[in-house]
Interface confidence: low
């Protein structure tokens, strides 16, 4: 007898994992055999859709590989023309193990800013997201929060926030871990210990100490009077993100030394500066005490000027007289490279004989100053133009180095050779004028260089000598 369709096994909710098989069963009793159709969310499932398999006269619907988009309400409808059509519906709940769809990435951030490490997830049930820092679960606090999206937000990033992070997505079906990422906190360069100012004696050593920190560890550069440090030795060490730089200087002139700590943040730099002055004690006062000893000149600069195996006065007020005096001459010598050919040999002779004065040995070794007449010959004849220019520069504060003050004698304070011929030293390089010998007595020289013309007498000279400083 004809029998209207009856669905004997109503559809139930089916849970299925992605990529697994899901089957709905719609058992129907009827006569004649019914036609059974299937819908998903009220849209007909086509028989030829290869993602589905419909068997047992349409009573079994199999989804061959579940996708998360298969989620929805599935209904079967049976109709055999006898009575009305019958329908039963059930839900497909696509269960999904957690999946991290937007993993976190390495982040570099400057201390004090806000950092966000992304972690977007999928899964059913919806995964909960937590974070691990290093090996431990990250605890949320006033600065740290896991957002609804799963991302980690850190306000006012601190150095201690740096480290390795990973996010963890978890639901009843499993757990997913992101790859480990690095949060690097960069810190502007900062000076922890500034160099200290020093007041020292000429020719002594000074060590300027500068300590800085920052992330990345800063580099330290030293500036001397606005230029890169040209001499001295720099010792550096780095420990625990602190760079320690020591500049050891051999002091021959006062200076302003600046320690500059620099580090780089992307394309930008941060710098910190600290400065110290090195002044020279008694710099402006002539040295009154002749403390020192006689020794053969063993330097290089004055080899061509001083007599062979000359006995010179070495001043023990310097830490290392030989090298202090050599360095003094060396620096001043370089400044003579630009003077006129007439002036240069005379100035070199004056410089070397003034810094490395002839020495009279004895119970108390005594330096023998240059005779005033020779000094005036250099000043008022050979180098008049240059001497005047130098004194003008000195008055106007234009001299780059104050070191020349120690290497230029004050002629007016030197003894005259007419007072006591043995009390002062002559400059063999400035030989007397043979046509007009009244100014200087004859002298012998193994290295004649320039004839001295007729000198104006020192008493009638209209050239005023501004006070400079003498080494002795």
């Amino acid at each position: 007898l004809p029998k209207a369709p009856v669905i004997t096994t109503p559809l139930e909710t089916v849970d299925a994992l992605v990529e697994e098989v899901a089957t709905f069963m719609c058992a129907v009793e009827s006569y004649p055999q019914p036609e059974i159709s299937w819908t998903r969310n009220k849209i007909l499932i086509k028989l030829f859709d290869t993602r589905y398999s419909i068997r047992e006269n349409g009573q079994l619907l199999t989804i061959l590989s579940v996708e998360d988009s298969d989620d929805g309400i599935y209904c079967c409808t049976a109709n055999n023309g006898v009575g009305g059509a019958v329908e039963s519906c059930g839900a497909l709940q696509v269960k999904m193990k957690p999946k991290i769809t937007r993993p976190p990435i390495n982040v570099k951030i400057i201390e004090g800013l806000k950092a966000v490490l992304p972690c977007t997830t999928m899964g059913n049930p919806k995964p909960s997201v937590s974070w691990i820092k290093g090996d431990s679960p990250l605890r949320e606090n006033s600065r740290t929060a896991v957002l609804e999206s799963g991302s980690l937000r850190i306000h006012n990033v601190q150095k201690e926030d740096a480290g390795q992070y990973r996010c963890v997505a978890k639901n009843s079906l499993g757990t997913a871990y992101s790859k480990v990422v690095k949060l690097e906190v960069e810190v502007f360069a900062r000076i922890l210990r500034a160099p200290e100012s020093h007041n020292v004696t000429f020719g002594s050593f000074v060590t300027l100490h500068c300590t800085a920190t920052g992330i990345p560890v800063p580099t330290i550069t030293w500036i001397e009077n606005g230029n890169a440090v040209s001499s001295g030795s720099i010792q550096e060490s780095v420990k625990d993100r602190v760079i320690d730089s020591r500049l050891q200087l051999f002091i021959t002139k006062p200076g302003l030394y600046t320690c500059i700590a620099t580090n780089k943040h992307g394309e930008k730099f941060s710098t910190a500066k600290a400065a110290a002055t090195v002044s020279i004690a008694e710099w402006s006062k002539p040295q009154k005490d002749n403390k020192g000893y006689c020794a053969q000149y063993r330097g290089e600069v004055c080899n061509a000027v001083l007599a062979k195996d000359a006995l010179v006065f070495l001043n023990t007020s310097y830490a290392d007289p030989e090298e202090a005096q050599e360095l003094l001459v060396h620096t001043a010598w370089n400044e003579l490279k630009v003077v006129s050919p007439l002036c240069r040999p005379a100035a070199e002779a004056l410089l070397c004989n003034h810094v490395f004065q002839e020495c009279s040995p004895g119970v108390v070794p005594t330096p023998i100053p240059i005779c005033r007449e020779y000094c005036l010959a250099v000043k008022e004849l050979f180098c008049a133009k240059e001497w005047l220019a130098m004194e003008e520069k000195t008055h106007r504060g234009l001299y780059r180095s104050e070191m020349h003050l120690l290497s230029v004698p004050e002629c007016s304070k030197l003894p005259s050779m007419h007072w006591d011929p043995t009390a002062c030293a002559r400059l063999p390089h400035l030989d007397y004028n043979k046509e007009n010998p009244k100014t200087f007595p004859p002298m012998t020289s193994s290295k004649p260089s320039v004839d001295i013309p007729n000198l104006p007498s020192s008493s009638s000279s209209s050239f005023s000598v501004s006070p400079t400083y003498s080494m002795t």
Epitope: F205, T207, S231, G232, S233, Q235, Q248, F250, Y293, A295, R298, G299, E300, V301, A319, D320, E322, E323, E326, L327, H330
Partner: antibody
Framework: ELQLVESGGGLVQPGGSLRLSCAAS????????MSWVRQAPGKGLEWVSA????????YYKESVKGRFTISRDNAKKTLYLQMNSLKSEDTAVYYC??????????????WGQGTLVTVSS | QAVVTQEPSLSVSPGGTVTLTCGLS?????????PDWYQQTPGQAPRGLIY???SRHSGVPSRFSGSISGNKAALTITGAQPEDEADYYC????????????FGGGTKLTVL
């Protein structure tokens, strides 16, 4: 990389001569003072000689004065120690060392590996 | 001629603190002697540790420190490590006409 490489050591009879060389690289040689330091087998360090950056002066331990000569060729970045009238007590490993600054004396902040000089008949 | 004196040997436990001293047979060590300290392990060239009394050479751990205490220079190792077992030499700049740089006899430090 800063390197100091000594050479020229060897076996020599008493009264003989040797010339040690120290080739420098990795730093501005003519900005620094240099020294020779020696170490007799099983003994401590002994400073021998020093020279400032410009070679303008030379310094020696009293016992080697007149027999040893320190010199430098800044163009070749090489330090030398000419040793004459050698005695058995000069037997030692000779180290070349760099000063931390220009003058001849003070901290030695880099050392070579040394070259052995043996004075024996 | 003044002799630079050092303890022939000292020992320290790992993590402990030890002070090596450097004196003069006649007179006191002062800052103008610019005391320097060197470390030498067997078969190796010496290595600079401290220069000019208290400045550390580049790369030297902060556990090494230098000072002048009383009439001697001192090298202090705070928190000694096994790798600190070595010979330690001090050297003094002896300003005189002959300009000498004099090493002490060395201290053999054992880290027990």
């Amino acid at each position: 990389e800063l390197q100091l490489v000594e050479s020229g050591g060897g076996l020599v009879q008493p009264g003989g001569s040797l010339r040690l060389s120290c080739a420098a690289s990795g730093f501005t040689f003519d900005d620094y003072g240099m020294s020779w330091v020696r170490q007799a087998p099983g003994k401590g360090l002994e400073w021998v000689s020093a020279i400032p950056w410009n070679g303008g002066s030379t310094y020696y331990k009293e016992s080697v004065k007149g027999r040893f000569t320190i010199s430098r060729d800044n163009a070749k970045k090489t330090l030398y120690l000419q040793m004459n009238s050698l005695k058995s007590e000069d037997t030692a490993v000779y180290y070349c060392a760099k000063r931390s600054g220009r003058i001849a004396f003070g901290a030695l902040d880099a050392w070579g590996q040394g070259t052995l000089v043996t004075v024996s008949s | 001629q003044a002799v630079v004196t050092q303890e022939p040997s000292l020992s320290v436990s790992p993590g402990g603190t030890v002070t090596l001293t450097c004196g003069l047979s006649s007179g006191s060590v002062t800052a103008s002697n610019y005391p320097d300290w060197y470390q030498q392990t067997p078969g190796q060239a010496p290595r600079g540790l401290i220069y000019s009394t208290d400045s550390r050479h580049s790369g030297v751990p902060s556990r090494f420190s230098g000072s002048i205490s009383g009439n001697k220079a001192a090298l202090t190792i705070t928190g000694a490590q096994p790798e600190d077992e070595a010979d330690y030499y001090c050297a003094l700049y002896m300003y005189s006409d002959s300009k000498l740089y004099v090493f002490g006899g060395g201290t053999k430090l054992t880290v027990l």
